[in-house]
């Protein structure tokens, strides 16, 4: 999916109002310095591409974050403010359904959500030069 045509300001507002807080809730009890940010993004569409991938694609050690509250609200925001996004999700979700097991918070999942927080922060500062 090409995130170029999303309403970035509305997604940012939703992130600041609620998604960010759900990410913090997920990470509660974890030190902010515990994980190094290894995933980066260069502009807002690229950030959303990486956020989409880390949030909804299963990875080794973290089968799926897709059922978490922050993920559901992320999906809703992308669907509402990125034209055509909801139509692209069918195959990905069908593949995920067999793998879902909610509330198994592994260290790998915590690391992945820490990366997500970094991507979202970068999304909110689009004018900063890439480090």
């Amino acid at each position: 999916y090409d995130f170029t045509n999303c309403d970035f300001e509305k997604i940012k507002a939703a992130y600041l109002s609620t998604i960010s807080k759900d990410l913090i809730t997920y990470m509660s009890g974890t030190k902010s310095t515990e994980f190094n940010n290894t995933v980066s993004c260069s502009n807002r569409p690229h950030c959303l591409t990486e956020i989409q991938s880390l949030t909804f694609n299963p990875t080794a050690g973290c089968a799926s974050l897709a059922k978490e509250m922050f993920a559901m609200k992320t999906k809703a925001a992308l669907a509402i403010w990125c034209p055509g996004y909801s139509e692209t999700q069918i195959n990905a979700t069908q593949a995920m359904k067999k793998r879902r097991k909610r509330k198994v918070t592994t260290n790998k999942c915590l690391e992945q959500v820490s990366q997500l927080q970094g991507l979202w922060r970068r999304f909110n500062r689009p004018l900063l030069k890439q480090q």
Epitope: K10, A13, A14, L16, S17, T18, K21, D22, I24, T25, A66, K67, M69, M72, K73, K75, A76, A77, A79, I80, Y85, S86, E87, Q89, I90, A92, T93, Q94, K97, R102
Partner: antibody
Framework: QVQLQQSGADLVRPGSSVKISCKTS????????MNWVKQRPGQGLEWIGQ????????NYNGKFKDKATLTADKSSSTVYMQLSSLTSEDSAVYFC??????????????WGQGTSVTVSS | EIVLTQSPALMAASPGEKVTIICSVS???????LHWYQQKSETSPKPWIY???NLASGVPVRFSGSGSGTSYSLTISSMEAEDAATYYC?????????FGSGTKLEIK
């Protein structure tokens, strides 16, 4: 404008099933999670579950996992809830509700008028 | 699951009286995830206050909401007859979504 129109009242026999509908209009149906809420006579509100019509993803309240089945038909912008093995405990008004961002916080922002289901022999 | 306890369950207020309804949450949630709905008999619930303190469209300014963590409240600065209804708090912090048991507010 956003509208959620639910099917009419149902009188059903114990042990049977019922399927109630919620026809939507005025918004991009595939992009919004749709919720179902139960209210027994004189009682409070109880969340049953939600469906995302874009891909059919569902989240259920564990209490209703074996009772309710949520589906969506994108061609008619309608969500459905089937209730099975009905008992008197299932006699209630059932509401559909859209979830969306209002003031950029996430909540149930539009509600259907409710469907009354009465289970009686 | 997160349990929301409302108090009082039933109350009556005179016109012009200040009214406060409390919603206690069993585990701490962020303010953006606490909402209030108004329901009058035989009708569907209406969104009333979003994210602890944001009034829904059309809600009179005599209503306000506040709170954080495990304690939230809805306040009416000056009770009017049209405010007689049942008010429910609801959390969107974790699944399953849950509602408070409701506060029925009557006019004296």
């Amino acid at each position: 404008q956003v509208q959620l129109q639910q099917s009419g009242a149902d009188l059903v026999r114990p042990g049977s099933s019922v399927k109630i509908s919620c026809k939507t209009s005025g918004f991009a149906f595939s992009s919004y999670y749709m919720n179902w809420v139960k209210q027994r006579p004189g009682q409070g509100l109880e969340w049953i579950g939600q469906i995302y019509p874009g891909d059919g993803e569902t989240n259920y309240n564990g209490k209703f996992k074996d009772k309710a089945t949520l589906t969506a038909d994108k061609s008619s912008s309608t969500v459905y809830m089937q209730l099975s093995s009905l008992t008197s405990e299932d006699s209630a008004v059932y509401f559909c509700a859209r979830a969306g961002y209002s003031d950029y916080v996430y909540a149930m922002d539009y509600w259907g008028q409710g469907t009354s289901v009465t289970v009686s022999s | 699951e997160i349990v929301l306890t409302q108090s009082p369950a039933l109350m009556a207020a005179s016109p012009g009286e200040k009214v406060t309804i409390i919603c206690s949450v069993s585990s701490s949630i962020t303010s953006s995830n606490l909402h209030w709905y108004q329901q009058k008999s035989e009708t569907s619930p209406k969104p009333w206050i979003y994210g602890t303190s944001n009034l829904a469209s059309g809600v009179p300014v005599r209503f306000s909401g506040s709170g954080s963590g495990t304690s939230y409240s809805l306040t009416i600065s000056s009770m009017e007859a049209e405010d007689a209804a049942t008010y429910y708090c609801q959390q969107w912090s974790s699944f399953p979504l849950t509602f408070g048991s409701g506060t029925k507010l009557e006019i004296k």
